[in-house]
């Protein structure tokens, strides 16, 4: 280790490179400066992402993976640091960058939105479930009429190209559907989506975007909702949605609409049953929706409401939605 009175001059790392290793993914690599003295001290490196989004962190190893959009270019710097309890010594920065890809910004797509959904797998020999992906976008305002767009997603180490597109009136792809993907329902990794394009008339700038799964996962509605009236008690029950998340991971909202006076009651629950006191003169429609609870992942989207069930008035026998 360094003695208190020992002077050390820190030199910047060498051979700093940025390599694109996948869709919206780069690998930063560098080497320790060969002229660095006191090689036995605990040297670290500070990595600074300059663009497209500022970030900085420290590492002891000489490489770093970074998940980032690349359509705006990418710029990073790294320097050697030596820190103890009292001070921080640092070298000058070594920098590298990736330029924005060719094509004017107006040629790339805009308003890319994606949603995931869980469905039963019709192909599987076992009763298993798949994560589907649906994305839509708008054609770039400066894109020539012959522009064609192509969508890819990456999740973890899987990258797939879209095979099922929807088109606009000019035959340009404006939406994509993956019935089955390698996306994990419970995954915590970013979903990376890239839409690039081609035209005979000009370069089309690609567009990539990162999505947090919790923010785009369209939860299925609750299953087997039943409602039954006994006197002035309305009993509602349901089952958890088709989902990778277990039973304790759901919040629910129950909506009870009195069709006679228009009164709307909405209750938020963590259980899969609810009892409401009602008048026995009215007819009611009942709906339930679900969301994954913040106990199990970050807050996300509510499901669609279940199909309405009508009870009350002359319909005192239980009704079931299948």
């Amino acid at each position: 280790d360094l003695l208190p009175d020992e002077k050390i001059s820190l030199l910047p790392p060498v051979n700093f490179t940025i390599k694109v290793t996948g869709l919206a993914q780069v690998l930063l690599q560098w080497k320790p400066n060969p002229d660095q003295e006191q090689r036995n001290v605990n040297l670290e490196y500070q990595v600074k992402i300059n663009a497209p989004k500022e970030d900085d962190y420290e590492t002891r190893i000489t490489e770093s993976k970074c998940v980032t959009i690349l359509h705006k270019g990418f710029s990073a710097s790294v320097r050697t640091i030596l820190q103890n309890d009292h001070s921080l010594l640092a070298s000058s920065w070594a920098s590298a960058e990736l330029h924005a890809p060719p094509g004017s910004p107006g040629t790339s797509i805009v308003n890319l939105t994606c949603t995931t959904n869980t469905t039963e797998d019709n192909y599987s020999r076992l009763r298993s479930y798949q994560v589907s992906l649906h994305c839509t976008w708008l054609v770039g305002t400066d894109a020539p009429e012959d522009t064609q767009y192509f969508l890819y997603y990456r999740y973890g180490s899987w990258t797939e190209e879209c095979q099922e597109y929807s088109k606009d009136t000019l035959g340009r792809n404006i939406a994509c559907w993956f019935p089955r993907t390698f996306i994990l329902s419970k995954g915590r990794d970013w979903l990376a989506v890239l839409v690039n394009g081609s035209s005979k008339h000009s370069a089309i700038r690609p567009f990539d975007q990162l999505f947090a799964l919790h923010a785009i996962d369209q939860i299925n509605p609750p299953l087997n909702v039943t409602a039954e009236i006994e006197g002035t008690r309305l009993s509602i029950q349901w089952e958890k949605p088709v989902s990778a998340f277990p039973i304790h991971c759901f919040d629910y909202e129950v909506k009870i609409h009195n069709t006679r006076n228009g009164y709307l009651q909405i209750e938020k629950l963590m259980t899969n049953a609810f009892i409401s006191i009602i008048d026995d003169l009215s007819k009611y429609d009942v709906q339930v929706r679900a969301a994954v609870s913040s106990m199990c992942r970050e807050a996300g989207l509510w499901s669609e409401w279940s199909q309405p069930i009508y009870v009350g008035n002359d319909e005192h026998k239980p009704l079931r939605e299948w």
Partner: antibody, heavy 121, light 112 residues
Framework: QVQLQESGGGLVQPGGSLRLSCAAS????????MSWVRQAPGKGLEWVSA????????NYADSVKGRFTISRDNAKNTLYLQMNSLRAEDTAVYYC??????????????WGQGTMVTVSS | QAGLTQPPSVSAAPGQRVTISCSGS?????????VHWYQQVPGTAPKLLIF???NRPSGVPDRFSGSKSGTSASLAITGLQAEDEADYYC????????????FGGGTKLTVL
């Protein structure tokens, strides 16, 4: 009845190459991602590689990346594993298996009987 | 080190109950990812025994069951029979691994 039948194993010298095949029948091959899993003598299972149903997307274990190439011919219902720059540690029984997923987590529902690859001088 | 840890061997007498543990980490089982179990009778290919933590494919007796808690999973076999003597492997998804597939080292079950 799902059937997976591997072939192409044998004895090869270090640095050599070998191509394994897996003939599939009894299911719609083109609907399924497929995989290779290996097992060294007296050892456990090690996932090697996988390929999506259309054959355009592939994945490899770090131990074989850059040396092995997985591919498929859906018209022939056949999965392949091209193995180059073979090493002694690649000696194993190589199994062909379907790469199914449940909520995205992979599992291997059907397996072939395996083909033995021995890398030795 | 990435991977799932299993005991190398377990043994029990016929008719007894035995459990095989599978210990992981936050990058696999601890993230809630499903665990699958395989049975490999000596000299044969592995066979899927349990998928999605606790579901049995058709043809697998209900003597086999799976469970999961925290960063660990376990396989339980009740009413042990001689034909259950085999190697058992757990498998899951690991977000830290290239390719994401992770197996346990395997457990040799001996029926005494």
């Amino acid at each position: 009845q799902v059937q997976l039948q591997e072939s192409g194993g044998g004895l090869v010298q270090p640095g050599g190459s070998l191509r394994l095949s897996c003939a599939a029948s009894g299911f719609t091959f083109s609907n399924y991602a497929m995989s290779w899993v290996r097992q060294a003598p007296g050892k456990g299972l090690e996932w090697v590689s996988a390929i999506n149903s259309g054959g355009k997307s592939t994945n490899y274990a770090d131990s074989v990346k850059g040396r092995f190439t997985i591919s498929r011919d859906n018209a022939k219902n056949t999965l392949y594993l091209q193995m180059n720059s073979l090493r002694a540690e690649d000696t194993a029984v190589y199994y062909c298996a379907d790469y199914a997923t449940n909520y995205g987590v992979p599992y291997f529902g059907s397996w072939g009987q395996g083909t033995m690859v021995t890398v030795s001088s | 080190q990435a991977g799932l840890t299993q005991p190398p061997s377990v043994s029990a007498a016929p008719g007894q109950r035995v459990t095989i543990s599978c210990s992981g980490s936050r990058s696999n089982i601890g993230s809630g990812y499903d665990v699958h179990w395989y049975q490999q009778v000596p000299g044969t290919a592995p066979k899927l025994l349990i998928f999605d933590d606790n579901n049995r494919p058709s043809g697998v007796p209900d003597r086999f069951s799976g469970s999961k808690s925290g960063t660990s999973a376990s396989l339980a076999i009740t009413g042990l029979q001689a034909e259950d003597e085999a190697d058992y492997y757990c498998q899951s998804y690991d977000s830290s691994l290239s390719g994401h597939v992770v197996f346990g080292g395997g457990t040799k079950l001996t029926v005494l």
